[in-house]
C-alpha cells in the first residue's frame, strides 16, 4: 500500500493555516486501525501519533518552509511512509508604510504623551519597524514583531521633540520608508510677570502708567488681560509671543493691586499682584504713586 502527503494549500502565504492529509489511495483507513504521524525534516509535528489522518497547522511562517512527510502504522506495527513533500511558505513583502500620531495631527502639548504609530498595509512574518527623527535620520528605536503596526512612545514631550519623523518597515525584502510627519509642540504659557513703568521714579496724578505683562514661555499668539483689584482694565494681544503693555492715565482711584493674566488657548496663568500706593511727600503739593 502506498501513502501520500497532501498539503492544502500547497503554496501557503505566511501567517495562513495549512492542513496536512495523509492519504492511502488503495486502502480505506476503516479497513484497519491506523495511527498517523506527521514529520518535518526529522522532527515529529503536533501531537505525534494520532488516529486522525489530518493535521491542522494554525499559521505557517517562512521558517516552516521545509520537507514534510507522514507515516501510518497498523495495529500489527507495520509502518508505511509517504514520499517527502516540499512546502514553500511565501512571504509577502511590506508595502504602504505609514506613520500616524496619537494625538492625531501631530500637535501635542508640552509635557503630554506622544505616540508614533508605524503601520504597513501589507507584509507578513517578522517585521522590523524603525523610527527616525529629523531629515538626517537619527535612529530612535527598532522593534521586531509579527504584526502590521508598532508604536514608539515619548511619555512627556519637550520642545526638542518638535521635529520631522518617519518610520521604516522591513521583512527581508529591503527597507520601505513612510512619509515624513511633522510634530508641533504647543507650549502653555508660563506664569507672567507684571511690571509697572512710570515716566519718573514717583509717578504723579495724570502721568501715564504703563502696565507691562510678559510670559517668558508660551506658544503664540498670547492674549494678556490686565486687572485692577480684579476689575478688568482691558486686554492686549501678542501675536508673535513676547509681552504686551496697557497704558493708564493715573488718578487717585488707581491705588491698589494690579495683576495680569496670560492665555494662549492652552490654559491661563495669572501674575503675582503688584501694589501701587499713593504717598504724599512732606511739603509736596501733589500726590505721588509708589509701587
Amino acid at each position: 500500500a502506498e501513502l501520500f502527503l497532501i498539503a492544502s494549500p500547497s503554496h501557503p502565504t505566511e501567517g495562513s493555516p495549512v492542513t496536512l492529509t495523509c492519504k492511502m489511495p488503495f486502502l480505506q483507513s476503516s479497513d484497519a486501525q491506523f495511527q498517523f504521524c506527521f514529520f518535518r525534516d526529522t522532527r515529529a509535528l503536533g501531537p505525534g501519533w494520532s488516529s486522525s489522518p489530518k493535521l491542522q497547522i494554525a499559521a505557517m511562517w517562512k521558517e516552516d518552509t521545509g520537507s514534510y512527510w507522514c507515516e501510518a502504522q497498523t495495529m500489527a506495527s507495520k509502518v508505511l511512509r509517504s514520499r517527502r513533500s516540499q512546502i514553500n511558505v511565501h512571504r509577502v513583502p511590506v508595502a504602504d508604510v505609514s506613520l500616524e500620531t496619537q494625538p492625531p495631527g501631530g500637535q501635542v502639548m508640552e509635557g503630554d504623551r506622544l505616540v508614533l504609530i508605524c503601520s504597513v498595509a501589507m507584509g507578513t512574518g517578522d517585521i522590523t519597524f524603525l523610527w527616525y527623527k529629523g531629515a538626517v535620520g537619527l535612529n530612535l528605536q527598532s522593534k521586531t514583531q509579527r504584526s502590521l503596526t508598532a508604536e514608539y512612545e515619548i511619555p512627556s514631550v519637550r520642545e526638542s521633540d518638535a521635529e520631522q519623523y518617519y518610520c521604516v518597515a522591513e521583512n527581508g525584502y529591503g527597507p520601505s520608508p513612510s512619509g515624513l510627519v511633522s510634530i508641533t509642540v504647543r507650549i502653555p504659557v508660563s506664569r507672567p510677570i507684571l511690571m509697572l513703568r512710570a515716566p519718573r521714579a514717583q509717578a504723579a496724578v495724570e502721568d501715564v502708567l504703563e502696565l507691562h505683562c510678559e510670559a517668558l514661555r508660551g506658544s503664540p499668539p498670547i492674549l494678556y488681560w490686565f486687572y485692577h483689584e480684579d476689575i478688568t482694565l482691558g486686554s492686549r494681544s501678542a501675536p508673535s509671543g513676547g509681552g504686551a503693555s496697557f497704558n493708564l492715565s493715573l488718578t487717585e482711584e488707581h491705588s491698589g493691586n494690579y495683576s495680569c493674566e496670560a492665555n494662549n488657548g492652552l490654559g491661563a496663568q495669572r501674575s503675582e499682584a503688584v501694589t501701587l500706593n499713593f504717598t504724599v511727600p512732606t511739603g509736596a503739593r501733589s500726590n505721588h504713586l509708589t509701587s
Epitope: 502639548m109 509635557g111 519637550r158 520642545e159 526638542s160 508660563s190
Partner: antibody
C-alpha cells in the same frame, strides 16, 4: 554631537563694555530659545538673558539685575549667540554659560567663559 | 520671583549609601494645563558646567543613570540617589521653570 563654545570673557574695568559670543553646533539652532546663565565665584546659578526663536519674533527677556545694561542677540545664519554687556559692575564678575532652553529646563550647557570686573 | 529653598546645604555620605535632598518652592510648580511640575535638577561637578539630570520633576534625562530619581509635586520635591558612587560627588541644584527661571542655592555632596 551638540557643542556650545563660549568666548570673549576677560578682565574689564567697572563701567566698561564687553561682548560674549557662543558658537553652536550639533542641533537646529534656529528653532530653540537660548539663554545666558551666570555663576559668580563660589555661588549659585542665575539666569541673565533669554532670546526666543525667529518664530517668536526673537523676543528677549532680562533679569532685573542686568536690564538696560545687557543685550542678548543671535545670528541664526552663523549659529551664534551674543551677549553685549555695558556699564559693567563688580557684581557682574562670574562664569557666563551659553545654554539651550528645552521646554524650560536647560539640557545643553557650554563650558563657560569668565568675566572679571575689577579696577 | 519664585524662591527655591534647598536642604541640606551640604551632605557627607559614604559610597553605596542612599541619599535624599529636598527642594521647596515658594509657589506651586504644578501647571494646570498639562499636570506637569515645572522643576528640574542639575548636577555640577567641581570645575565643570551643570548637567541636566531630571526634568518635569521626575523624568530622567537621556544617559542619566537610573540611581537618580526625582519625585514630588506642587511645592515639595526630592532628588534621591539610591546608591551613591564616587563620581556623584558634586553640587546639586533644583530649578523652577513655571515662571522666570530661578535656582536653589544647591546641596553639596561630599565623601564622609
Amino acid at each position: 554631537e551638540v557643542r556650545l563654545v563660549e568666548s570673549g570673557g576677560r578682565l574689564v574695568q567697572p563701567k566698561g563694555s564687553l561682548r560674549l559670543s557662543c558658537a553652536v553646533s550639533g542641533f537646529t539652532f534656529n528653532t530653540y530659545a537660548m539663554y545666558w546663565i551666570r555663576q559668580a565665584p563660589g555661588k549659585g546659578l542665575e539666569w541673565v538673558a533669554r532670546i526666543r526663536s525667529k518664530t517668536n519674533n526673537f523676543a528677549t527677556y532680562y533679569a532685573d539685575s542686568v536690564k538696560d545694561r545687557f543685550t542678548i542677540s543671535r545670528d541664526d545664519s552663523q549659529s551664534m549667540l551674543y551677549l553685549q554687556m555695558n556699564n559693567l559692575k563688580t557684581e557682574d564678575t562670574a562664569m557666563y554659560y551659553c545654554v539651550r532652553d528645552n521646554s524650560g529646563s536647560f539640557d545643553y550647557w557650554g563650558q563657560g567663559t569668565t568675566l572679571t570686573v575689577s579696577s | 520671583d519664585i524662591v527655591m529653598a534647598q536642604s541640606p546645604s551640604s551632605l557627607a555620605v559614604s559610597v553605596g549609601e542612599k541619599v535624599t535632598m529636598s527642594c521647596k518652592s515658594s509657589q506651586s510648580l504644578l501647571h494646570s494645563s498639562n499636570q506637569k511640575n515645572y522643576l528640574a535638577w542639575y548636577q555640577q561637578k567641581p570645575g565643570q558646567s551643570p548637567n541636566l539630570l531630571i526634568y518635569w520633576a521626575s523624568s530622567r534625562e537621556s544617559g542619566v543613570p537610573d540611581r537618580f530619581t526625582g519625585s514630588g509635586s506642587g511645592t515639595d520635591f526630592t532628588l534621591t540617589i539610591s546608591s551613591v558612587q564616587a563620581e556623584d560627588l558634586a553640587t546639586y541644584y533644583c530649578q523652577q521653570y513655571y515662571s522666570y527661571p530661578t535656582f536653589g542655592a544647591g546641596t553639596k555632596l561630599d565623601l564622609k
